[in-house]
């Protein structure tokens, strides 16, 4: 049975030419983390593995950093950033845990952090 | 088009160190992916050995790690195989390819090294 | 270590045949798995990785399947080409293992 919960930075927003990062925490349960993925709509972003470590994919390697701990840091945003991404753990013997967060860029400077939320 | 190319001794005594490097030519080691040693075994057996990462960080298969080293030279674009105290055991054919999330997109031609007095 | 069951060893089969070959792994690996084909005297060629996913270039006649722990590669209509050993490899864990190849013969 899955216990599990993932808590994520929920609907946040950053200025376009800033950076912000992505976190997703895994909690209420006692599985092991094998490996995390970071995901942007359909586009596989990175890949954490608990035994390989970080893969970035080539074609976001410019603007994507692994990190803090299992969490992304995106780099240089564009408008085109906007949209949802998914933190999705792997882990043993739950299976796999989904955590969404909504990324919207702003032109301008009010760019504010959404508050924090639950994803069972 | 990326091209990888293996060179190195094709005979090595048993207790030596083997080293191997890994040319590689239209792509920049430093600018993404990983790049990976890999050897086939007489018997068609393909065992992964380890990779640098463009950023230079290293995993090497637990079963060498006593006795691998990968590095790389990025003024040259190169990357390298130091395996020590070989025995004849390590005669094989060793590849160096290019990993993306932990497969291998391109390969090496493969360069067959003999571990013999 | 994860460990990669392929069956069969060997396979004879004519051109124009369908030809299936499997992949059994000691532990669920989700879709993280790539198929490889290398003929003799070459260097492996990627074929498939994620479990399905056709390689740039590959031909369509290959597709690749499963999740978890069992996984197949299929070949309709063989093309004189297609003859060597196929290998499957899992990108899961470290180690990163192969199975022990399936070789493909012209009958």
């Known amino acids: 049975m899955m216990t599990g919960t993932i808590e994520t930075t929920g609907n946040i927003s950053a200025e376009k030419g800033g950076s912000i990062i992505l976190q997703c925490h895994l909690s209420s349960t006692t599985a092991q983390v094998t490996q995390v993925n970071w995901e942007q709509q359909d586009q596989l972003l990175a890949i954490c593995n608990a035994d390989l470590g970080w893969h970035i994919s080539p074609s976001f390697k410019d603007r994507v950093a692994p990190g803090p701990g299992l969490g992304l840091t995106l780099q240089s945003l564009t408008v085109n950033d906007t949209g949802e991404y998914f933190c999705i753990y792997h882990t043993y013997p739950d299976g796999t845990y989904t955590g969404r967060i909504f990324l919207e860029v702003l032109e301008s400077s009010v760019a504010e952090h959404g508050a924090r939320f639950q994803i069972p | 088009d990326v091209q990888l190319q293996e060179s190195g001794p094709g005979l090595v005594k048993p207790s030596q160190s083997l080293s191997l490097t890994c040319t590689v030519t239209?792509?920049?080691?430093?600018?993404?992916y990983d790049w990976h040693w890999i050897r086939l075994f007489p018997g068609h057996i393909l065992e992964w050995m380890?990779?640098?990462?463009?950023?230079?960080?290293?995993i090497y298969n637990p079963s060498l790690k006593s006795r691998i080293s990968i590095t790389h030279d990025t003024s040259k674009n190169h990357f390298f195989l130091k395996l020590n105290s070989v025995t004849t055991e390590d005669t094989a054919t060793y590849y160096c390819?290019?990993?993306?999330?932990?497969?291998?997109?391109?390969w090496g031609a493969g360069t067959t090294v003999t571990v013999s007095s | 270590d994860i460990q990669m069951t392929q069956s069969p060893a060997s396979l004879s089969a004519s051109v124009g045949e369908t030809v299936t070959i499997t992949c059994r792994v000691s532990?669920?690996?989700?879709?993280?798995l790539a198929w490889y084909q290398q003929k003799q005297g070459k260097s492996p060629q990627l074929l498939v990785y994620?479990?399905?996913t056709l390689a740039e270039g590959v031909p369509s006649r290959f597709s690749g399947s499963g999740s978890g722990t069992q996984f197949s590669l299929k070949i309709n209509s063989l093309q004189p080409e297609d003859f060597g050993t196929y290998y499957c490899?899992?990108?899961?864990?470290?180690?990163?293992?192969f199975g022990a190849g399936t070789k493909v013969e012209l009958k």
């Open positions: 994620n479990a399905k």
């Open positions: 390819a290019r990993g993306s999330f932990w497969y291998f997109d391109v």
């Open positions: 532990e669920h690996i989700y879709n993280y």
């Open positions: 380890g990779y640098i990462s463009y950023s230079g960080n290293t």
């Open positions: 239209g792509y920049s080691i430093t600018s993404a």
């Open positions: 490899q899992h990108n899961y864990g470290n180690p990163l293992t």
